[in-house]
Amino acid sequence: SYQVICRDEKTQMIYQQHQSWLRPVLRSNRVEYCWCNSGRAQCHSVPVKSCSEPRCFNGGTCQQALYFSDFVCQCPEGFAGKCCEIDTRATCYEDQGISYRGTWSTAESGAECTNWNSSALAQKPYSGRRPDAIRLGLGNHNYCRNPDRDSKPWCYVFKAGKYSSEFCSTPACSEGNSDCYFGNGSAYRGTHSLTESGASCLPWNSMILIGKVYTAQNPSAQALGLGKHNYCRNPDGDAKPWCHVLKNRRLTWEYCDVPSCSTCGLRQYSQPQFRIKGGLFADIASHPWQAAIFAKHRRSPGERFLCGGILISSCWILSAAHCFQERFPPHHLTVILGRTYRVVPGEEEQKFEVEKYIVHKEFDDDTYDNDIALLQLKSDSSRCAQESSVVRTVCLPPADLQLPDWTECELSGYGKHEALSPFYSERLKEAHVRLYPSSRCTSQHLLNRTVTDNMLCAGDTRSGGPQANLHDACQGDSGGPLVCLNDGRMTLVGIISWGLGCGQKDVPGVYTKVTNYLDWIRDNMRP
């Protein structure tokens, strides 16, 4: 039966009809009492006092309502949940993930996890209603957990008309013996000992380091991974593992050349709620590799939206060469990651200036052959974009990737809803298209326009009359991603390049074929 529920937009928690709850007001000491009424939360401030007993984890401050028994936790940065039990910065799980308290909420199939408090799970052995729910990490959220000591975190998903458990696609912290780091590498305990410039690390117990804070003599050395070795570590929460080095007889430090463990192509996909001409409105967390590129024009003040882009590593964005025909100076370009609304700043967005950009030197502005460009983001360190639920790299395809004809893939972008529209979309959109066989991606299928081996075609193959809302890329989507699921990860197959109109029946969009440029990409991204 259909149930009216409320979703608290601030916390993403769900509540049943007539259920009440307390919530802290961000950046203030106020607390609100909320009540679920006909699918809408009605909230007002209430007086509170300090709790009589500690109820919050991870340093949360407990406050209880003055006139009734409920309590609320003000969580320190990096923690969330009713009792601050959720670690919003956990990027991977250790061992079987029994202690995992992160925010991954996507199953291996790509399905979105169901909130553990959902009434649909009331009869399941594990739900947020259990008396030991907090201890097991269950509660009013839909994050992957391993409450039953299974082999890895899992959750309930709704498929084939019922709720069943499915393993999650949460990244594992230690992938076999691969020597790489997750997040900022503060948990890295591998054996790399060379810096990015090729210098050898000094042992953390070296006499030369006397007087330095982070050495084997630090009282917390063991917990920080420091000792009688010269392995790279990140004891101070820096951007990535580093070490002390001697450079020209001077003591300094450098970041290490430890590779970061790839979480590329993993995302927390949420089913789009709104159809729109040419596609569906989407959230950036579903397409965390999507970049928005803005440009300052010599003639007009301010910045205007230019093109889409694709995050392929911390400091590099892939885009389409034709977006840069105006030859903008790099300092006139801005790249924004983590933004759902094209011109409205997102809470977790990351904004970058551009160090330089490289347009393929054989780009043909008549045919759009070799329509590919790379932008290097500007940063003070060797890291630029910080991974989060809304910012993550896409996977580059293996060189020999050959997906079957008609494979369903997706594209995203902030482009127009239809060819004749004067405006770009105000919100990120996604579209679902299928890969055309090369026999259907030729000049004769595209009004005699040149189609080269560096291009591929994809389009919406659904039938429908003239009013059918066929999915496609459109003006403004250029430079953005065409991604397909491969080995459980979203993999970049094409770069949105050109097309004849938008969303026309039997007329596919044309994309730059990424597998043809892997060596070019790698070559140009060299340090």
Partner: antibody, heavy 114, light 112 residues
Framework: QVQLVQSGAEVKKPGASVKVSCKAS??????INWVRQATGQGLEWMGR????????GYAQKFQGRVTMTRNTSISTAYMELSSLRSEDTAVYYC?????????WGQGTLVTVSS | DVVVTQSPLSLPVTPGEPASISCRSS???????????LEWYLQKPGQSPQLLIY???NRFSGVPDRFSGSGSGTDFTLKISRVEAEDVGVYYC?????????FGGGTKVEIK
């Protein structure tokens, strides 16, 4: 530290093919390059492979005769040279490239003789 | 293809004295990403080559500071401030900016 260990010496007849392997340990995400050196001669770059994605770049001189592959599960790169002739007799090196060819294998002598 | 020419072909040296090797490319070796991938390698007798200098002037880890690299565009130089007996071998300059990557012909450094 990256370490590269190559397969042993080979003797081949003209027209045959040879496949040399290069096992990497340490940071295995860098390009593997192949360089050859005929006895008493200089170094000659043959091509490169990205061990992650498997993309390759070959010197024109070897295009069509050389194939570079990799097996990521065992961190090994391979260089196969076909239609061998006597002038292909050389020591073949693999070298790992990040900002330069910083780490080299010990070399594999391939002798082409009838 | 970029042709890389080294001179001299052979360089007899006295320990403690300086030495210099020149390397010239047939065209600019500035990569499209702005970097200049000019490297110097030393191959000691019976050994694999070893990296000395990368990106024109950066010394690789463990390389003594008597080795230095300089230059730009098409002209590059490797200098050894005071040659030591262990520095003998063949020195190669190499460009990694344009495919095919190419080595110079080599300079044989030997003690007088």
């Amino acid at each position: 530290q990256v370490q590269l260990v190559q397969s042993g010496a080979e003797v081949k007849k003209p027209g045959a093919s040879v496949k040399v392997s290069c096992k990497a340990s340490g940071n295995t995400s860098y390009w593997i390059n192949w360089v050859r050196q005929a006895t008493g001669q200089g170094l000659e770059w043959m091509g490169r492979i990205d061990p992650g994605g498997g993309s390759t770049g070959y010197a024109q001189k070897f295009q069509g005769r050389v194939t570079m592959t990799r097996n990521t599960s065992i961190s090994t790169a391979y260089m196969e040279l076909s239609s061998l002739r006597s002038e292909d007799t050389a020591v073949y090196y693999c070298a790992s490239y990040y900002y330069a060819m910083a780490y080299w294998g010990q070399g594999t002598l391939v002798t082409v003789s009838s | 293809d970029v042709v890389v020419t080294q001179s001299p072909l052979s360089l007899p040296v006295t320990p403690g004295e300086p030495a210099s090797i020149s390397c010239r490319s047939s065209q600019s070796i500035v990569h499209s990403n702005g970097n200049t991938y000019l490297e110097w390698y030393l191959q000691k007798p019976g050994q694999s080559p070893q990296l000395l200098i990368y990106k024109v002037s950066n010394r690789f880890s463990g390389v003594p500071d008597r080795f230095s690299g300089s230059g730009s565009g098409t002209d590059f130089t490797l200098k050894i401030s005071r040659v030591e007996a262990e520095d003998v071998g063949v020195y190669y300059c190499f460009q990694g900016s344009h495919v095919p990557w190419t080595f110079g012909g080599g300079t044989k450094v030997e003690i007088k």
